[in-house]
């Protein structure tokens, strides 16, 4: 899909403003918050999506054990700084000059410091573990059906190359989806696993980023998969640097 010519909207990002002011009167879409032009044939980067979200009016078999270095996004929403390509800048600061380093999915990976804090590089998140608990059903889902449908979802809805969906684990009622993508594996044009995971997370919460009817209806052999809880663990190519105080808290 590209931006639809007839009504000029962005199929892959509803947090955009679109107008036919591109070359030859073509539809061009810009992300809210940053004003950056986005490619509506693929997913928008998480950084631009978070920025758009902050600018929008506020509404009143064996399961994997995450490694000791796995990060969970406990800090929640913030207004990020994005680079010209829409990626997170390695160092993020708030309005009170408190700064911290983030990974490629925008999750804090150091203690908070002041403006003197240095973040030498944007560290890549190469392994994402999505941990879901589904609502009780009459019986367990068939593992192979569940695996096939989740792989199809990531391939067709999020346009993530199948090789990056490393595994789907299932022990009722827990589902785990493992996404893996090293720097060396990611070719130009490949969807980033962090972006795919973010779109999936928003879909599961009923906050779809796609234009359309506003909900993900995920079915396994006709039965809706209703997710009660979502936890996402992020593993970076270089382990995070937190003080011992935080690690023992």
């Amino acid at each position: 899909h590209t931006a639809a010519q007839d009504n000029c909207t962005c199929p892959t990002n509803k947090m955009t403003v679109c107008s036919p002011d591109g070359p030859g009167g073509r539809c061009q879409c810009r992300a809210l918050g940053s004003g950056m032009a986005v490619d509506c044939s693929t997913l928008t980067s998480k950084c631009l999506l978070l920025k758009a979200r902050m600018s929008a009016p506020k509404n009143a078999r064996t399961l994997v054990r995450p490694s000791e270095h796995a990060l969970v996004d406990n800090d929640g929403l913030y207004d990020p700084d994005c680079d010209p390509e829409g990626r997170f800048k390695a160092r993020q600061c708030n309005q009170t000059s408190v700064c911290w380093c983030v990974n490629s999915v925008g999750v804090r990976r150091t203690d908070k410091g002041d403006l003197s804090l240095r973040c030498d590089e944007l560290v890549r998140t190469h392994h994402i573990l999505i941990d879901l608990r589904h609502r009780p059903t009459a019986g367990a889902f068939n593992h192979s059906d569940l695996d096939a449908e989740l792989r199809r979802l990531f391939r067709e809805r999020y346009r993530l190359h199948p090789k990056f969906v490393a595994a789907v684990h299932y022990e009722q009622p827990t589902i785990q989806i493992e996404l893996r993508q090293n720097t060396s594996q990611k070719a130009a044009g490949d969807v980033d696993i962090g972006d795919a995971a973010y779109y999936f997370e928003r879909d599961i919460k009923g906050e779809s980023l796609f234009q359309g009817r506003g909900g993900l209806d995920l079915r396994v052999r006709g039965e809706p998969l209703q997710v009660e809880r979502t936890l996402i663990y992020y593993l970076d190519e270089i382990p995070p640097k937190f003080s011992m105080k935080r690690l023992t808290a």
Epitope: R157, R213, G215, D217, P224, Q226, E228
Partner: antibody, heavy 119, light 112 residues
Framework: QVQLQESGPGLVKPSETLSLTCTVS????????VNWIRQPPGKGLEWIGV???????NYNSALMSRLTISKDTSKNQFSLKLSSVTAADTAVYYC?????????????WGQGTLVTVSS | DIVMTQSPDSLAVSLGERATINCKSS????????????LAWYQQKPGQPPKLLIS???SRESGVPDRFSGSGSGTDFTLTISSLQAEDVAVYYC????????FGGGTKVEIK
């Protein structure tokens, strides 16, 4: 542009098998499923069954023993077979696209084909 | 199987007046995770296939006039036509997709 078109014999004899085809265009059969719905003359809508994008099927429990839904991706066609028909199976038969992950709504329908069961 | 019960069976309303159609399901259609209801409303005019009006109980489809609105949650749902127009004469159906699919019996809307 999304289109669905039902086709098949307009008249079927009692106890025989009703066979219908739904030919689609404008979308991939691996990305969307197709439902069959019927409507007896002057009556309401009854869901018959679905073939999901992944290839699995679900049928209306009242019709399950007589029903088969399949697809031929190379021909862009879905087919419905209903065996041992009676006059109660006389209806307009519709096929409709499932909206995949955007909700199981039927946003695109064929125009329908009337099937009469009579000797 | 989930049973969908619509009321009334038929409804005669003056042009410009409000028309209200009710739909009750035999079990809740609410997805507690996404807080969305698996309910749709369709309009069918004579000799035509049904047309999707409302999805997720209250989301109006693009191109559907804003005089049509859907409300409700769980087991009780309502379709409201705020100001009936001549072109709204049709049969209206609710449909659940929480557990496969079931249509309500339909409500015929006419002009008084």
């Amino acid at each position: 542009q999304v289109q669905l078109q039902e086709s098949g014999p307009g008249l079927v004899k009692p106890s025989e098998t009703l066979s219908l085809t739904c030919t689609v265009s404008g979308f991939s059969l691996t990305s969307y499923g197709v439902n069959w719905i019927r409507q007896p003359p002057g009556k309401g809508l009854e869901w018959i069954g679905v073939m999901w994008a992944g290839g699995s099927t679900n049928y209306n429990s009242a019709l399950m023993s007589r029903l088969t839904i399949s697809k031929d991706t190379s021909k862009n066609q879905f087919s419905l077979k209903l065996s041992s028909v009676t006059a109660a199976d006389t209806a307009v038969y519709y096929c409709a696209r499932d909206e995949n992950w955007d909700g199981a709504w039927f946003a695109y329908w064929g125009q329908g084909t009337l099937v009469t069961v009579s000797s | 199987d989930i049973v969908m019960t619509q009321s009334p069976d038929s409804l005669a309303v003056s042009l410009g007046e409000r028309a209200t159609i009710n739909c009750k399901s035999s079990q809740s259609l609410l997805n507690s995770g996404t807080r969305k209801n698996y309910l749709a409303w369709y309009q069918q005019k004579p000799g035509q296939p049904p047309k999707l009006l409302i999805s997720w109980a209250s989301s109006r489809e693009s191109g559907v006039p804003d005089r049509f609105s859907g409300s409700g949650s769980g087991t009780d749902f309502t379709l409201t036509i705020s100001s009936l127009q001549a072109e709204d004469v049709a049969v209206y159906y609710c449909k659940q997709s929480y557990n496969l699919f079931t249509f309500g019996g339909g409500t015929k809307v006419e002009i008084k």
